[in-house]
């Protein structure tokens, strides 16, 4: 998606095991914003670094989610990321964003398919049409031809989610239109959950 | 609470071309995408297309590529809609309206600019 | 693109009516569908969304029904502040289009 999520994530990856678990146990702790929500401690600790750059975009969105990260990484004595992340959000502009009052009635989750990204890995099943629509304009020839490698419906789905964090929005409309073209009870039945 | 407030109505010959600006307040900017409608008198509304602030990616509708293009200055929480090469078709009603809700699996518009009048004439 | 056919074009009841406007889109939408008021000189208000759930701080006198192709607005005891017209709007796939719109008067 954006530069703030794109930071995050490569903060997240620079981590150690350890230093992920101990980042993990912070948030669960740390003092949250009025208005936004802790994410589950039973889906945090099973999270790897994708899965929780996904989970802080779509629980606190990019700007917020980028000062949490700075924070926890911060109280963690490690400084030198979270400085790496503080120059992202002055360059992308995130400082005004982030210091807006969160609205009611405003979303504070993420986009659809970021959301849902283990109910689409376990529950898609006719991956050959949403790759086909996503072929060229979303999904280069070379990642079209590694999901289509891979042998079960959910190895295919979770190949794809690993393009995810690199999509802009329009990527990811492009795949929750395939998935509302292809599977829309799916999609409905996930919308009520 | 949310609010999006448009510039004022214009006047502008053929040819020309206009900025139609959309501020928002009471939410962050790059947390939700802002779409742009045309309406004009007498007639329904079509969809311009769409500018996601967050990530600066764009989409839109067929009918108005290359006479739209949608931006955004994130430090002034406002979004932008260019329209050029401008005909007596272009005179209309544009809106720039917010879905209402980011996480959804389509988008409903919950808030509307007050709409900006844009009339093309010599 | 996908076209939303609306009807009536234009609808003349009385207090206390019960009214129905109908959208027909030309291929399967599901629930997308969302149904907009618009007042005379207004923007337009979000009535119903995903067909059927109506929209935070609106009348329940409004109702909306339908999936798949076909789609009704239900107005229940007709109020003079109902007056307007009324759009609706699939948000199944982009282009995202709108409906002619129904304009409604009271006798």
């Known amino acids: 998606m954006g530069r703030a999520r794109d930071a995050i994530l490569d903060a997240l990856e620079n981590l150690s095991g350890d230093e992920l678990k101990k980042f993990k146990m912070k948030l669960l702790t740390v003092q949250l914003r009025e208005g936004y929500g802790r994410i589950p401690r039973g889906a945090l600790l099973q999270m790897d670094a994708i899965d929780l750059t996904d989970k802080l975009v779509s629980y606190y969105l990019e700007s917020y989610g980028l000062e949490l990260t700075m924070t926890v990484l911060r109280d963690m004595g490690l400084q030198e990321l979270a400085e790496q992340l503080q120059t992202t959000k002055e360059e992308s502009g995130a400082v005004a964003a982030a210091a807006s009052v969160p609205a009611q009635s405003t979303a504070r989750t993420g986009h659809f398919v970021d959301q849902h990204r283990q109910a689409l890995i376990a529950r898609v099943t006719e991956v050959d049409g949403v790759l086909d629509a996503l072929h060229g304009s979303v999904l280069t020839e070379g990642q079209y031809q590694a999901v289509r490698a891979e042998t079960t419906s959910q190895d295919k789905m979770r190949k794809l989610f690993s393009f995810v964090p690199s999509w802009n929005l329009t990527c990811k409309d492009s795949l929750l239109q395939a998935l509302k073209e292809i599977h829309p009870y799916l999609v409905m039945d996930l919308e009520q959950s | 609470q949310v609010q999006l407030q448009q510039s004022d109505a214009e006047l502008v010959k053929p040819g020309a071309s206009v900025k139609i600006s959309c501020k928002v307040s009471?939410?962050?900017?790059?947390?939700?995408?802002i779409h742009w409608m045309k309406q004009r008198p007498e007639q329904g509304l079509a969809w311009i297309g769409y500018?996601?602030?967050?990530?600066?990616?764009?989409n839109y509708n067929d009918k108005f590529k290359g006479k739209a293009t949608l931006t955004a200055d994130i430090s002034s929480s406002t979004a932008y809609m260019q329209l050029n090469s401008l005909t007596s078709e272009d005179s209309a009603v544009y809106f720039c309206?917010?879905?209402?809700?980011?996480?959804?699996?389509?988008?409903?518009?919950?808030?509307w600019g007050q709409g900006t009048t844009l009339t093309v004439s010599s | 693109d996908i076209q939303m056919n609306q009807s009536p074009s234009s609808l003349s009841a009385s207090l206390g009516d019960t009214i129905t406007i109908t959208c027909h889109a030309s291929q399967n939408i599901n629930v997308w569908l969302s149904w907009y008021q618009q007042k005379p000189g207004n923007v337009p208000k979000l009535l119903i969304y995903?067909?059927?759930k109506l929209h935070t701080g609106v009348s329940s006198n409004f109702s909306g029904s339908g999936s798949g192709t076909g789609f009704t607005l239900t107005i229940s005891s007709l109020q003079p502040e109902d007056i307007g017209t009324y759009y609706c709007q699939q948000g199944q796939s982009y282009p995202y289009t709108f409906g002619g719109g129904t304009k409604l008067e009271i006798k």
């Open positions: 309206t917010r879905p209402y809700y980011f996480g959804s699996s389509y988008d409903y518009f919950g808030y």
């Open positions: 995903k067909a059927s």
């Open positions: 500018m996601y602030p967050g990530d600066g990616s764009a």
């Open positions: 009471g939410y962050a900017l790059t947390d939700h995408s």
